[in-house]
């Protein structure tokens, strides 16, 4: 899997999307995991409901929230009060049992807030993206659901 | 109608190789996983792998690591098992099944015989 | 890996018999447990899906129970047509593992 780079600004919201191939994971519940390390586990933020067919109901672990549109075949996380600790490798997962197959690969990145003047020396500024094999990066400017916007849940 | 068309039987002498074919019709390949399993005579059925057409990672069991290669081609809608080094009990019937969604091997090749005979 | 028991491993009953055919997980599986029956010369076809679900087209006298660790595939009333072999298959956690099957025939 190539990783995307998504970056968001200290102290705003980060949305990043995962879009997959609905048939494929019909069914399927979704998860937002953290990589420890290069080779390491990939640690569970958080994942969809239990329900599959609630999937399209958000559900927060702290700061991070997950939405699955499973039938337009995007899971959608949000990294709300971006902080520099938030920077790192991640992976959106689709679960299987015990196992999982990862969606993407996500490298999220964290900007220093342009209108902050405070000492911005615990900010980790991120190296040049070219070190991640064929990178692609999204800059992400997210926003709240308005109510009412939920979509309708799939039936089957 | 979703049909999965295995190649036809296989003599292989011992250590040497050969290429199974499994070719889907009726469902776009990159929208499953594809495994292959397979049934040694009169025995009962052993899992080998499993393979991701769409981007092609995959998962083997821990006996068949240097035994079987699966590979697939999207373009023909096709997904391939090379067996390597044959041995005369790699002599069996290879099955290849689909997985996608909640669906596990609901779709299953006819199969293929390999003999494996000097 | 996960180790499959399955049992009996032959079975013969009698044309209308209740049947039970028995799998024992040596790991928790959740529900993550397929039931195939398998003619001879022919591929598996698929029966109950994740411990309880009946697959598509499969006549009612089949039916599935169990999770965690014991399944159970049920034989209402059974049928002529029903001599086959029985597998169990867990899916919950690569490698996949299959039962070592049961032999169906009638009395």
């Known amino acids: 899997h190539n990783t995307t780079v998504f970056q968001g600004v200290a102290g705003q919201s980060l949305q990043v999307s995962c879009p997959y191939d609905s048939m494929k994971h019909w069914g399927r519940r979704k998860a937002w995991c953290r990589q420890l390390g290069e080779k390491g586990p990939c640690q569970r933020v958080v994942s969809t409901h239990n329900l599959w067919l609630l999937s399209f109901l958000r559900r927060w672990n702290g700061s991070t929230a997950i939405t699955d549109d499973t039938l337009g075949g995007t899971l959608t996380i949000t990294l709300r009060n971006l902080q520099p600790h938030d920077a790192g490798l991640y992976q959106c997962q689709s679960l299987h049992g015990s196992e999982a197959d990862t969606l993407r690969k996500v490298l999220v990145e964290v900007l220093a807030d342009p209108l902050d003047h405070r000492d911005a020396g615990d900010l980790w500024f991120p190296g040049e993206s070219e070190s991640f094999e064929d990178a692609h990066v999204e800059h992400s400017i997210s926003r709240s659901l308005l109510e009412g916007e939920i979509p309708f849940p799939p039936t089957s | 109608e979703v049909q999965l068309q295995q190649s036809g039987a296989e003599l292989g002498k011992p250590g040497t190789s050969i290429k199974l074919s499994c070719k889907v019709s009726g469902f776009n390949i990159r929208s499953t996983f594809m495994h292959w399993v397979n049934q040694r005579p009169g025995k009962g059925l052993e899992w080998i792998g499993r393979i991701d057409p769409a981007n092609g990672n995959t998962v083997y069991g821990e006996k068949f690591k240097n035994k079987a290669t699966l590979t697939a081609d999207t373009s023909s809608n096709t997904a391939y098992m090379q067996l390597s080094q044959l041995k005369s009990d790699d002599t069996a019937i290879y099955f290849c099944a689909l997985e996608f969604g909640v669906s596990w091997f609901e779709y299953w090749g006819q199969g293929t015989l390999v003999t494996v005979s000097s | 890996d996960i180790q499959m028991t399955q049992s009996p491993s032959f079975l013969s009953a009698s044309v209308g018999d209740r049947v039970t055919i028995n799998c024992k997980v040596s790991q928790n599986v959740d529900r993550n447990l397929n039931w195939y029956q398998q003619n001879l010369g022919e591929p598996p076809k698929p029966l109950i899906n994740?411990?309880?679900s009946l697959q598509t087209g499969v006549p009612s006298r089949f039916s599935g129970s169990g999770s965690g660790t014991d399944f159970t595939l049920t034989i209402s009333s059974l049928q002529p047509e029903d001599v086959a072999t029985y597998f169990c298959l867990q899916h919950n956690s690569w490698p996949l593992t299959f039962g070592s099957g049961t032999k169906l025939e009638i009395k």
């Open positions: 994740f411990a309880n």
